[in-house]
């Protein structure tokens, strides 16, 4: 169901429009539901989900993570470079969004949607932003060789590597949830 | 089985510092989503949300107690520890650690401590 | 700081009846707001989370509902187990706050 249908928007009918902060939240929650039934399916085909061999992949994965300096964090929060930040973080999580497009096989639909939803995201937090001259779009040259590194890899590194970006963009999401909260 | 149990001094006397211990088993505290909070209870009134740790390190007090509290975490030891500074009668309450755990952040405490009463 | 206030704050009612509590907030916390049940002597549990959603082995009679500012707690067909104060509880941003407490005497 898309954010801003449910069935709890149905019951409501004297509820007001949904304003910019909520429709971030739904947003990211909706990704959110997205990446735990893909995060299934992957759990389901493979033992990635409880393998101590991580390390191994993330290396050569340059995945988006919060840092404090990032002004995230409740210790040195900044509304605005963190919003930089999260666009930011987002933008650079596009191509490994890419990459996931055909690394499922039943849920194809799913992997397609939370992909379309990120890029609607990022649309509604760039209106929320300030500075957009701060934010720096990842090069698309570069993005276009990560992509055929990343599917050149055997097939054990390409389930570890769908594996890392769900997590990751998971907790990039879940961090950014809190944040956003914050503002 | 997620379980968590508080230890530290039933005692402590007035300007000394409380250091709580929190003991968890059952879940990572270095898992996306999950969050353990410090909650206390005077005798007879309600409850009153202290301090939060989360997986990443991010943590949150509460303003008006915020420069006495410290929260730390020791993911291998499956630990959390608060300590507050200076503490006073008024400080009296049952101290209760609690573990959130959820994809969407709802902060709810969905496992509590038994509590452990500091006079 | 988001206010969290209950109402009433204590009420008393008999097995089999059905009772309702609100909880308002004092800005939007969306559907953020979790409920507690503590008996005396005892650690709280969580009752309902996201405003509407039953905790695991949380029986069907309690049922929370609202959003944005305005929560309630309803609980049918009352059993002696329910007896207690609950709490509800801010889980939108931090500070995290708890309202005062609505007692139910059974």
């Known amino acids: 169901v898309p954010p801003g249908e449910d069935s709890k928007d149905v019951a409501a009918p004297h509820r007001q429009p949904l304003t910019s902060s909520e429709r971030i939240d739904k947003q990211i929650r909706y990704i959110l539901d997205g990446i735990s039934a893909l995060r299934k399916e992957t759990c389901n085909k493979s033992n990635m989900c409880e393998s101590s061999k991580e390390a191994l992949a993330e290396n050569n994965l340059n995945l988006p993570k919060m840092a404090e300096k990032d002004g995230c964090f409740q210790s040195g929060f900044n509304e605005e470079t963190c919003l930089v930040k999260i666009i930011t973080g987002l933008l650079e999580f596009e191509v490994y969004l890419e990459y996931l497009q055909n690394r499922f096989e039943s849920s194809e639909e799913q992997a397609r949607a939370v992909q379309m939803s990120t890029k609607v995201l990022i649309q509604f937090l760039q209106k929320k932003a300030k500075n957009l001259d701060a934010i720096t779009t990842p090069d698309p040259t570069t993005n276009a060789s990560l992509l055929t590194k990343l599917q050149a890899q055997n097939q054990w590194l390409q389930d570890m590597t769908t594996h890392l970006i769900l997590r990751s963009f998971k907790e990039f999401l879940q961090s950014s949830l809190r944040a956003l909260r914050q503002m | 089985q997620v379980t968590l149990k508080e230890s530290g001094p039933t005692l402590v006397k007035p300007t000394q510092t409380l250091t709580l211990t929190c003991s968890f088993s059952?879940?990572?505290?270095?898992?996306?989503?999950?969050?353990v909070g410090w909650v206390r209870q005077p005798p007879g009134k309600a409850l009153e949300w202290l301090a939060f740790i989360f997986w990443d390190d991010d943590k949150y007090y509460s303003p008006s107690l915020e420069s006495r509290l410290t929260i730390t975490k020791d993911t291998s030891k499956n630990q959390v520890v608060l300590t507050m500074t200076n503490m006073d009668p008024v400080d009296t309450a049952t101290y209760y650690c609690?573990?959130?755990?959820?994809?969407?952040?709802?902060?709810?405490?969905?496992?509590w401590g038994q509590g452990t009463l500091v006079t | 700081d988001i206010q969290m206030t209950q109402s009433p704050s204590s009420l008393s009612a008999f097995v089999g009846d059905g009772v309702t509590m609100t909880c308002w907030a004092s800005q939007s916390i969306n559907d953020y707001l979790n409920w507690y049940h503590q008996r005396p002597g005892e650690a709280p549990e969580l009752l309902v989370f996201a405003a509407s959603n039953l905790q695991i082995g949380v029986p069907s009679r309690f049922r929370g509902s609202g959003s944005e500012t305005y929560f309630t707690l309803t609980i049918n067909s009352l059993q002696p187990e329910d007896s207690g104060t609950y709490f509800c509880q801010n889980g939108h941003s931090f500070p995290l706050t708890f309202g005062g407490g609505t007692k139910l005497e059974i």
């Open positions: 609690a573990r959130s755990a959820d994809d969407y952040l709802y902060y709810s405490f969905d496992t």
């Open positions: 059952g879940f990572s505290l270095s898992t996306s989503g999950v969050g």
